[in-house]
Structure formats: structure tokens, C-alpha cells
């Protein structure tokens, strides 16, 4: 066959679907690779062709669109499974072509089994709710296009294994689940099961997401530097190791980049000649507030090093702060025999 622009296997779009449920999968060519949509391609005389490679096989084969009850079908740029089977797992390719043009992309499709409590190997999206922030909602995801607006599905919500009924602060409202006031106890996996009829059959869509309750923007503050501080003096003799921790607390802020860095006499450690190492550790609270610690270490400090200024800087979307460490050279204790004895008039 003639040359075809092959975008390869698009592993970024690792599609996971539940066994025995409908699945609609759009050809990724129009979503991510080509600058035109299916309608434009179709009206230009291009044809969309689907084929697949079964799991653990190398052989590409056409998709069988003649299965009973049209179990697999194609509609415009969408491949439909009504419903999926476990052995539908494999790499699927959609190819757009005519006599002069060809472009194709493959993507992996994994059909996943779930247990009665909706546990499965499915990668779950995470939805963050602000703690004690007033009413917040989550919406049953990825159900658009499965049924027409004239069809009224039934939706049942679960937290873990339990149907959500008469929960204190969580109220199912159709496709939405409302949290009247989110608390840490609301952390967990939430599942919506959407049931709808189609051509005399009943289908179920199961969607699970993880709810994580995080710090509220109402409580967010600029970074707080706990160390260095004015209560601790790093008093060292030349030759000793100088260790200064910079410990910074960051409020949780959605999409904020938290940064911590040291400067020595105004320069980043990488830009100076002294042998300094920086080790960083990060910890998170239950509401995803972050504490970063960067320990500045000079193995064998010199008297020159003890005259430098060591400043810890921190920045988030809320602002920038800095604190200097109090560093000084230890004054050697007087030796009794010489200094003190002379001081007492001994000869």
C-alpha cells in the first residue's frame, strides 16, 4: 500500500472501559493530530477505516461490524461497543484516507472488570473539593453522547460500596452529587451508575471518581518560613559542617507552583564556587497543604563562609517571602592556663 502518515501508538490516550457496558470512542486523529474535523474530511471525500490488533497478537485485522445486535458499530468518527466484552482489549487504529491522502493513529483500549463494590484496575480521575467552602458539586463524568436528550436515565450514586441515601452532607441530584459542606470524612471514591434504555435493551454506565478534600482558598496564605528564624543561631567553627534547614509551609492552592530556593550572598548555590549541597523533602497534610524542607549543607565551613548571608526564599501564587539564617563564627573558649590565669594576676 502507498505511504501513510503514521502517528504511531498514542499511549497518552490509554482508554479504559468497563466490561459489559457501552463505550463510545472517538478517533483521536481529529482530536489531537489533524487540524480539521470529521465533517470536513468526510465532505472532502475521505473515508475513515477502523481495524485492530488483539491483545498479545501482532496481526492487524478488520473490526467485525456484522456482530449480532450490532455490538460493534461506527457512527461518523466514533467507534461504538454495545456493550464491550473482555476480549475487546487491544490496540485500535483509525485511518483516514482516499487515493491521494492517508493518515492513521493507533490507541490502546483496555476492557476492565469491576467487582460489586466498583473496585477495578481503572485509573480514577481525582476531583478536589475545598474544605468547608459551601455547596460544591461533582458531575457524573463522560456520559455525553450515549443517549439522546429525550431519554431520561436513572442515576444512582455510591460512596465506596454504599448507595448514597440520607447522607448528612451529600445529596444526589441526578447527574450531580452535591456536598453541602465538604469535610475530610468526604474523601473517597464516588460512583455514579447511569441506567438507560436503547432499542428494547437496558444499558449501564459506571463512572467512578476520587474525591479529595483540600485546603480552601479562603484560608490560603502566602508561604510561611518556619526555619530559618530569628530564634536559632548557627554558630560554627571553621572545619565544622554547616547545616541549615529551610522549612516552608504552603497553603493548598489549585494549580499553584510552590518554590523554595536558597541564595548565598544573593546568588543561587549553582552559581557560586563553594561546595554546597541542597537536599529537599516534601510532605503533605490531609488537605494537601505542603511543607517543603531544603537543607543547605557545607561539609567543611570556612571562616569566609561564616561571613556570607544565607537566605531562604519561597514563592507561591499567594506571594513571595524570604528569611535569612543567623550564621556566625564561634568564638573559641579561652584556655584557662594562659588567658584566665594571667587575668587573675598569676605569674
Amino acid at each position: 500500500s502507498e505511504r501513510c502518515d503514521d502517528w504511531g501508538l498514542d499511549t497518552m490516550r490509554q482508554i479504559q472501559v468497563f466490561e459489559d457496558e457501552p463505550a463510545r470512542i472517538k478517533c483521536p486523529l481529529f482530536e489531537h493530530f489533524l487540524k480539521f474535523n470529521y465533517s470536513t474530511a468526510h465532505s472532502a471525500g475521505l473515508t475513515l477505516i477502523w481495524y485492530w490488533t488483539r491483545q498479545d497478537r501482532d496481526l492487524e485485522e478488520p473490526i467485525n461490524f456484522r456482530l449480532p445486535e450490532n455490538r460493534i458499530s461506527k457512527e461518523k468518527d466514533v467507534l461504538w461497543f454495545r456493550p464491550t466484552l473482555l476480549n475487546d482489549t487491544g490496540n485500535y487504529t483509525c485511518m483516514l484516507r482516499n487515493t491521494t491522502y492517508c493518515s492513521k493513529v493507533a490507541f490502546p483500549l483496555e476492557v476492565v472488570q469491576k467487582d460489586s463494590c466498583f473496585n477495578s484496575p481503572m485509573k480514577l480521575p481525582v476531583h478536589k473539593l475545598y474544605i468547608e467552602y459551601g455547596i460544591q458539586r461533582i458531575t457524573c463524568p463522560n456520559v455525553d453522547g450515549y443517549f439522546p436528550s429525550s431519554v431520561k436515565p436513572t442515576i444512582t450514586w455510591y460512596m465506596g460500596c454504599y448507595k448514597i441515601q440520607n447522607f448528612n452532607n451529600v445529596i444526589p441530584e441526578g447527574m450531580n452529587l452535591s456536598f453541602l459542606i465538604a469535610l475530610i470524612s468526604n474523601n473517597g471514591n464516588y460512583t455514579c451508575v447511569v441506567t438507560y434504555p436503547e432499542n428494547g435493551r437496558t444499558f449501564h454506565l459506571t463512572r467512578t471518581l476520587t474525591v479529595k478534600v483540600v485546603g480552601s482558598p479562603k484560608n490560603a496564605v502566602p508561604p510561611v518560613i518556619h526555619s530559618p528564624n530569628d530564634h536559632v543561631v548557627y554558630e560554627k567553627e571553621p572545619g565544622e559542617e554547616l547545616l541549615i534547614p529551610c522549612t516552608v509551609y504552603f497553603s493548598f492552592l489549585m494549580d499553584s507552583r510552590n518554590e523554595v530556593w536558597w541564595t548565598i550572598d544573593g546568588k543561587k548555590p549553582d552559581d557560586i564556587t563553594i561546595d554546597v549541597t541542597i537536599n529537599e523533602s516534601i510532605s503533605h497534610s490531609r488537605t494537601e497543604d505542603e511543607t517543603r524542607t531544603q537543607i543547605l549543607s557545607i561539609k567543611k565551613v570556612t571562616s569566609e563562609d561564616l561571613k556570607r548571608s544565607y537566605v531562604c526564599h519561597a514563592r507561591s501564587a499567594k506571594g513571595e517571602v524570604a528569611k535569612a539564617a543567623k550564621v556566625k563564627q564561634k568564638v573559641p573558649a579561652p584556655r584557662y592556663t594562659v588567658e584566665l590565669a594571667c587575668g587573675f594576676g598569676a605569674t
Epitope: 548571608s309 537566605v311 524570604a322 535569612a324
Partner: antibody, heavy 122, light 107 residues
Framework: QVQLQQPGAELMMPGASVKVSCEAS????????MHWVKQRPGQGLEWIGA????????TYNQKFTGKATLSVDESSNTAYMQLSSLTSEDSAVYYC???????????????WGQGTLVTVSA | DIVMTQSHKFMSTSVGDRVTITCKAS??????VAWYQQKPGQSPKLLIY???YRYTGVPDRFTGSGSGTDFTFTISSVQAEDLAVYYC?????????FGSGTNLEIK
């Protein structure tokens, strides 16, 4: 309100030492670093150093090490800067300045004394 | 030491004009730059800190911007009382250094 009170002027002989004072009021003296800034007549501003009144820890601009010595007297809420071996180069206005309470010394200075003019002349 | 360079020693302007003073740092100082106004015979007065934050009680005709090494200070509509010397200062790392000052003259 916050006030930093400085004497207006000091006339000194070359080679002598001078101790410039800065009396603080309107805040807790030990809560905030005190900075000192030099301004020669018709010239710009130079940071000399700073002192933490809570423990008398000092940090200096190396240019002024050996020239300026910072100290505090907690009982009178007063910060001092001693200048030694005075020369005509030391003739300048010397300001004390501070930031908000609770801040480390990495900060700008919203509060300034009115400055002490030190004149070194034979 | 970090050197702060104010390229204009003098700037002449008229009441109502917009004036912009620039300041360049010899090293990246992030946003740790303050601007001060000093009138003849007075102490410096803080106008702007952290590059763009107006200090309490400072009129909103005074604004600051910049990050890294390049900073600007703007008076949107100059008033007669704005006659002064304006200094930039880095409060990023000691020794804290000031620009040489820009003397704003009113025509």
C-alpha cells in the same frame, strides 16, 4: 504610632568615635530588627547593617565591618551605631530604619528615623 | 554585591504627565525590589515593595512592576508635591543595595 527618634547632629574630630542613638517607641522593640543606612551629602543610600534586639545578633555590609558596630539597650528601647576612626568620608546623615514586627530582616523599610548628621571636621 | 542601576540621574516632567523610572539589578532578585521617595531634608519614604505592592497610604498614582532584573516605577499623573529623588532598593539579599537615585524635577 511607631517612632524612631534620633539626635539631629554630631560634630566630631577626625580619628574620634561617635555613638549615634535611635530611640524606638510605639512597638515592641525586641520584635523587629533595626537597620542602619548611610547617606553622604547629595549622594545615594548605603545599607550599613542590622541588629536583632532580641539577642543582639548583627549582620553587616562587609564594607562597614570594622567601621560600624551595632548594639542595643533593651531597657531604654534604644539602638546604637558606633563609628570608629572617623574621617571626612564618614561625614554623612545616618538613618535607623525598621520593618514590621515579627519580620526577619529580609525586607524593605517603611519606618525611618529622621537621621543624624555626623560631621567630621578638625 | 547586587548592583542596582538607575539609568537616569535627572528627569524633567510637567504636572499631569506620566513618568516612568527604570532600575536594573545586576543579578536576578525575583520581585524583591522597593521604591522610595526622598524629598529635600527628609527621610526616605517607602512607596512600593515586592516590585508591585503599594505601601499603606500611598496614592494609587504610584505603581511598580517588573521581576528578575528589570524594574519600573511609574507616576501616572505627576503632582507638584512629587518633586523628589526616587530610589530603587533590592530587599532580596544582604547587603541591601540602593540605586543611585533619580531626581524628578517639575518644569
Amino acid at each position: 504610632q511607631v517612632q524612631l527618634q534620633q539626635p539631629g547632629a554630631e560634630l566630631m574630630m577626625p580619628g574620634a568615635s561617635v555613638k549615634v542613638s535611635c530611640e524606638a517607641s510605639g512597638y515592641t522593640f525586641t520584635d523587629s530588627w533595626m537597620h542602619w543606612v548611610k547617606q553622604r551629602p547629595g549622594q545615594g543610600l548605603e545599607w550599613i547593617g542590622a541588629i536583632d534586639p532580641s539577642d543582639s545578633y548583627t549582620t553587616y555590609n562587609q564594607k562597614f565591618t570594622g567601621k560600624a558596630t551595632l548594639s542595643v539597650d533593651e531597657s531604654s528601647n534604644t539602638a546604637y551605631m558606633q563609628l570608629s576612626s572617623l574621617t571626612s568620608e564618614d561625614s554623612a546623615v545616618y538613618y535607623c530604619a525598621r520593618y514590621y514586627s515579627g519580620s526577619n530582616y529580609i525586607s524593605p523599610f517603611p519606618y525611618w528615623g529622621q537621621g543624624t548628621l555626623v560631621t567630621v571636621s578638625a | 554585591d547586587i548592583v542596582m542601576t538607575q539609568s537616569h540621574k535627572f528627569m524633567s516632567t510637567s504636572v499631569g504627565d506620566r513618568v516612568t523610572i527604570t532600575c536594573k539589578a545586576s543579578l536576578d532578585v525575583s520581585t524583591a525590589v522597593a521604591w522610595y521617595q526622598q524629598k529635600p531634608g527628609q527621610s526616605p519614604k517607602l512607596l512600593i515593595y515586592s516590585a508591585s505592592y503599594r505601601y499603606t497610604g500611598v496614592p494609587d498614582r504610584f505603581t511598580g512592576s517588573g521581576s528578575g532584573t528589570d524594574f519600573t516605577f511609574t507616576i501616572s499623573s505627576v503632582q507638584a508635591e512629587d518633586l523628589a529623588v526616587y530610589y530603587c532598593q533590592q530587599h532580596y539579599s544582604p547587603p541591601f543595595t540602593f540605586g543611585s537615585g533619580t531626581n524628578l524635577e517639575i518644569k
